[in-house]
């Protein structure tokens, strides 16, 4: 692959990564595909510092991240280990709530209005954040 040395136009550089913040909403899978076509992935939050950076840019708006449990266990889209990694769930979340009446539970994670995380129905049209790393050869993101 080709190495990226600077962020594309309209992306924000932070700590050797580039971030793109949507201003419209998509279902989680559509947002995931959008980022993949940009040779990026839905944002993977690996630290409190990155959490605060993303939170600052998205404001108090529900926003998808690259975390889901559609195949069972919670997984980050770039393969970052979930169990040992950073987490910022709201109290009593994730709860895989079935009471929404939309069928199934809640398999996709998003930032809530206060920045903490919640699991929700993946079809909800939330905003999203794409992330790509600088100085790293582009490669195909892992399949879900």
């Amino acid at each position: 692959g080709s190495e990226r040395t600077c962020c594309p136009v309209n992306w924000v550089e932070h700590e050797r990564s580039c971030y793109w913040f949507s201003r419209s909403g998509k279902a989680w899978a559509d947002a995931d595909n959008y980022c993949r076509l940009e040779d990026a992935h839905l944002v993977v939050v690996t630290s409190w510092e990155e959490q605060k950076f993303v939170q600052h840019h998205i404001g108090p708006v529900n926003t998808w991240m690259g975390l889901h449990d559609q195949n069972g266990p919670w997984k980050w889209v770039d393969g970052t280990d979930y169990e040992t990694g950073f987490k910022n769930w709201r109290p009593e979340q994730p709860d895989d709530w079935y009471g929404h009446g939309l069928g199934g539970g809640e398999d996709c994670a998003h930032f809530t209005d206060d920045g903490r995380w919640n699991d929700d129905v993946c079809q909800r049209p939330y905003r999203w954040v794409c992330e790509t790393e600088l100085d790293k050869a582009s490669q195909e993101p892992p399949l879900l």
């Epitope: 692959g1 559509d30 959008y34 993949r36 195909e140 993101p141």
Partner: antibody, heavy 120, light 107 residues
């Protein structure tokens, strides 16, 4: 000048294979997602496939999934479409198209097209 | 998959006329809507992206509007070179899909 030039179109029998090429010039090829779009004789436009700038991600129309493969060689500034198990309904002019800025911004540059005819 | 429809499928107009073409998506696509012009035997030409943004080099008589599911392409004063087929296309999600086209011919 930004330019796309398709080649490889031909007449082929049903079940046969063909590889189309699209040579790009005048822009930083690896920075843009690229698509194939086709148009059957007398019909409208049908999107076929898209590939990201690095070639790492690609998506297909249901009508070609499992039969067609999109790829690119950024060192040669060339886009490809490998077409297998061809059917009569694949007969069309095939255009390659460049995405405007991002992969969801529409196609701002089109090639002149190459004709694929599937017939026995 | 998102289905796109256009109306009318064809229309006859005269030079100087104001022409409006509508495009509808089967679900909300925000403003991920593009318009193309295709003259007979030629490759499509990009006119408008993001529902209302005019592509560089496209005459200002072309304009687009709409959001969600309903969109419009307007040609304020039809010129001889505008007689062609016009397609809308959604780029909200793959598979990207085109409308069936609207043919604008001379009255």
């Amino acid at each position: 000048e930004v330019q796309l030039l398709e080649s490889g179109g031909d007449m082929v029998q049903p079940g046969g294979s063909l590889r189309l090429s699209c040579a790009a010039s005048g822009f930083t090829f690896s920075s843009y997602a690229m698509s194939w779009v086709r148009q059957a004789p007398g019909k409208g436009l049908e999107w076929v496939s898209v590939i990201s700038g690095s070639g790492g991600s690609s998506f297909y129309a249901d009508s070609v999934k499992g039969r067609f493969t999109i790829s690119r060689d950024n060192s040669k500034n060339t886009l490809y479409l490998q077409m297998n198990s061809l059917r009569a309904e694949d007969t069309a002019v095939y255009y390659c198209a460049k995405d405007r800025v991002r992969a969801h911004d529409g196609f701002d540059i089109w090639g002149q097209g190459t004709m694929v005819t599937v017939s026995s | 998959d998102i289905q796109m429809t256009q109306s009318p499928s064809s229309l006859s107009a005269s030079v100087g006329d104001r022409v409006t073409i509508t495009c509808r998506a089967s679900q909300s696509i925000s403003n991920y809507l593009n318009w193309y012009q295709q003259q007979t035997g030629k490759a499509p030409k990009f006119l408008i992206y993001a529902a209302s943004s005019l592509q560089s080099g496209v005459p200002s008589r072309f304009s687009g509007s709409g959001s969600g599911t309903d969109f419009t392409l307007t040609i304020s004063s039809l010129q001889p070179e505008d007689f062609a087929t016009y397609y809308c296309q959604q780029s909200y999600s793959t598979p990207f899909t085109f409308g069936p086209g609207t043919k604008v011919d001379i009255k």
